[in-house]
Interface confidence: low
């Protein structure tokens, strides 16, 4: 069974300290091999997945994960209690909500149990690794003859999220996008009643509660306006 792992573009707040031991032999010891980097994401502050590329190991190895919180009441070393697997080899650890403390420095340690000196420790700021669920319940209503308002909900504290709205008509090649703050509503002041509009939204844990760079998935799209696009030149081009 192969697992699909979401990987980040990088987290500037991540610091990694690799503790490696070189054995005094001519050949390269297994303990000098770097361990894979651990990537953690906190999904809607409901659970966290910390994953690594298990296939980077020279031979299949069930690496183990320990974690703790630096300089806090939660500084006791904890063992991973729920491993994720890829082709029967450990490739991650899932932590539940009660084990997540967003504003304490999270320390994660990966170790090769066959070679205990081969270990790597990383420190992560979890508030920068939150990915909310996609916005839900998109609704549109007319404010005036030519003005539309888009509203949506998030399963999250509203003030913690910023949003990106994209919209386009059936005539448009590309999306027009607009940033929206935590108030989670968007107005389009000038709507052409002859065109069909599509809207979608995604959200990010930024900037009031954290500095996450990763957006949620896009919401399901919502449509407004005419379904008849007979005079749409791009549709003609597609049908030709």
């Amino acid at each position: 069974l192969n697992t699909t792992i979401l990987t980040p573009n990088g987290n500037e707040d991540t610091t990694a300290d690799f503790f490696l031991t070189t054995m005094p032999t001519d050949s390269l010891s297994v303990s000098t091999l770097p361990l894979p980097e651990v990537q953690c994401f906190v999904f809607n502050v409901e659970y966290m997945n910390c994953t690594w590329n298990s296939s980077s190991e020279p031979q299949p190895t069930n690496l183990t994960l320990h974690y703790w919180y630096k300089n806090s009441d939660n500084d006791k070393v904890q063992k991973c209690s729920h491993y994720l697997f890829s082709e029967e080899i450990t490739s991650g650890c899932q932590l539940q909500k009660k084990e997540i403390h967003l504003y304490q420095t999270f320390v994660v340690q990966l170790q090769d149990p066959r070679e205990p000196r081969r270990q790597a420790t990383q420190m992560l700021k979890l508030q920068n690794l939150v990915i909310p669920w996609a916005p839900e319940n998109l609704t549109l209503h007319k404010l005036s003859e030519s003005q539309l308002e888009l509203n949506w909900n998030n399963r999250f504290l509203n003030h913690c999220l910023e949003h990106l709205v994209q919209y386009r008509t059936d005539w448009d090649h590309s999306w027009t996008e607009q940033s929206v703050d935590y108030r989670h509503k968007f107005s389009l002041p000038s709507v052409d009643g002859q065109k069909r509009y599509t809207f979608r939204v995604r959200s990010r844990f930024n900037p009031l509660c954290g500095s996450a760079q990763h957006w949620s998935e896009w919401s399901h799209p919502i449509h407004w306006g005419s379904n008849t696009s007979k005079e749409n030149p791009f549709l003609f081009a597609l049908e030709a």
Partner: nanobody, 118 residues
Framework: QVQLVESGGGLVQAGGSLTLSCAAP????????VGWFRQAPGKEREFVAS????????YYDDSVKGRFTISRNNAWNTVNLQMNSLKVEDTAVYYC???????????WGQGTQVTVSS
């Protein structure tokens, strides 16, 4: 059920200070985050500041940054909002809210009126 009680509101001149307090009488908040919001007449309720249970996660709306300070006591049953350099536009009803599990603010106080006169 967490009962939240705000206090400390009142009438103050522009440039003055007030300290609002939010309490969960007889118990801790039992939640991950506590926030302050405000609602001026005819306007929507807006976020002011929030603080996490650990006290490390503190955030402010840009309109109050540098003037307002949110803090908590160690027992996690009182959260204060120190408001300095008050402006007329800070006039509003101020609400305290407690959020359980980051999904929503489940518990709200009744609000305390802050009026800033020129």
């Amino acid at each position: 059920q967490v009962q939240l009680v705000e206090s400390g509101g009142g009438l103050v001149q522009a440039g003055g200070s007030l300290t609002l307090s939010c309490a969960a009488p007889g118990r801790t908040f039992g939640t991950d985050v506590v926030g302050w919001f405000r609602q001026a007449p005819g306007k929507e309720r807006e976020f002011v500041a929030s603080i996490s249970r650990s006290g490390d996660g503190i955030y402010y709306d840009d309109s109050v940054k540098g003037r307002f300070t949110i803090s908590r006591n160690n027992a996690w049953n009182t959260v204060n909002l120190q408001m300095n350099s008050l402006k007329v536009e800070d006039t509003a009803v101020y609400y305290c809210a407690a959020g359980d599990g980051w999904s929503t603010y489940d518990y709200w106080g009744q609000g305390t009126q802050v009026t800033v006169s020129s």
